[in-house]
């Protein structure tokens, strides 16, 4: 659910880390209407999360602590 | 111990609604999904849908949206799963599990089951 | 949705026999997988998460293997309470898929 690069809504899908390889953050105040987690899948596939939801909390901080360890 | 205790048995009528229970204790309710399974007589088993207890967060299989509702009620720890305009098909034990991202998305604990009977 | 295909869906054994059922996903799941055992009456249980870690409590004769869409449960030496029926589960992404299921009999 993008466009323009700006996600419009969030996937009704849960996620497995082991399919994320990355994510970046869209925020409301820099050009998007909502705030994302924007995942990106080892299938080249980038899907909108909403930033609230535990499951989209969880991943971000693992993706966050390997970004740290490396 | 982690136990998570499903209510009993039902028979219902065709086009009614049944609510199951599950109430879970031995660990913060809050910190874990609950997932919901179906398992129709001498068949295999069948992802429902799953809730968030911390938020009510819910995801279902597209199978099941319409028919099954889970919500939770925190200040009891307890989850229910209703589902409604009952049919002969949906004759099944139906399951409550815990989620666990700790340990790889399991189902780590399994309500003892609830069987639900459709019919007229 | 991602399909999970188990092979076989019955298989007689004896005990003291090494036996492996396998699960083939419709698409790489990178090892987003785990196996259930279920007894007749009674609740799954929990066997392998992550296609290839032994759940708490679970013997080590169990163990699981595989990658991308092709995974594995191997029990190297049945013993008599390992008759049961045994499910593997996608978890990549919902809805989560369980396969068929395999039963394993004494024969």
């Known amino acids: 659910a993008s466009n323009f690069d700006c996600c419009l809504g969030y996937t009704d899908r849960i996620l497995h880390p082991k399919f994320i390889v990355g994510f970046t953050r869209q925020l409301a105040n820099e050009g998007c209407d909502i705030n994302a987690i924007i995942f990106h899948t080892k299938k080249k596939l980038s899907v909108c999360a909403n930033p609230k939801q535990t499951w989209v909390k969880y991943i971000v901080r693992l993706l966050s602590k390997k970004v740290k360890n490396m | 111990q982690v136990q998570l205790v499903q209510s009993g048995a039902e028979v219902k009528k065709p086009g009614a609604s049944v609510k199951v229970s599950c109430k879970a204790s031995g660990y913060t309710f809050t910190n874990y999904w609950m997932h919901w399974v179906r398992q129709a007589p001498g068949q295999g088993l069948e992802w429902m849908g799953v809730i968030d207890p911390s938020d009510s967060y819910t995801t279902y299989n597209q199978k099941f949206k319409g028919k099954a509702t889970l919500t939770v009620d925190t200040s009891t720890s307890t989850a229910y799963m209703e589902l409604s305009s009952l049919r002969s098909e949906d004759t099944a034990v139906y399951y409550c599990?815990?989620?666990?991202?700790?340990?790889?998305?399991?189902?780590?604990?399994w309500g003892q089951g609830t069987l639900v009977t459709v019919s007229s | 949705d991602i399909q999970m295909t188990q092979s076989p869906s019955s298989l007689s054994a004896s005990v003291g026999d090494r036996v492996t059922i396998t699960c083939r996903a419709s698409?790489?799941?990178?090892?987003?997988l785990n196996w259930y055992q279920q007894k007749p009456g009674k609740a799954p249980k929990l066997l392998i998460y992550?296609?290839?870690n032994l759940a708490d409590g679970v013997p080590s004769r169990f163990s699981g293997s595989g990658s991308g869409r092709q995974y594995s449960l191997t029990i190297s030496s049945l013993q008599p309470e390992d008759f049961a029926t045994y499910y593997c589960q996608n978890v990549l992404i919902t809805p989560y898929t369980f396969g068929g299921g395999t039963k394993l009999e004494i024969k």
């Open positions: 599990t815990r989620g666990n991202y700790g340990v790889d998305y399991a189902m780590d604990y």
């Open positions: 992550g296609a290839t």
């Open positions: 698409e790489n799941i990178y090892g987003a």
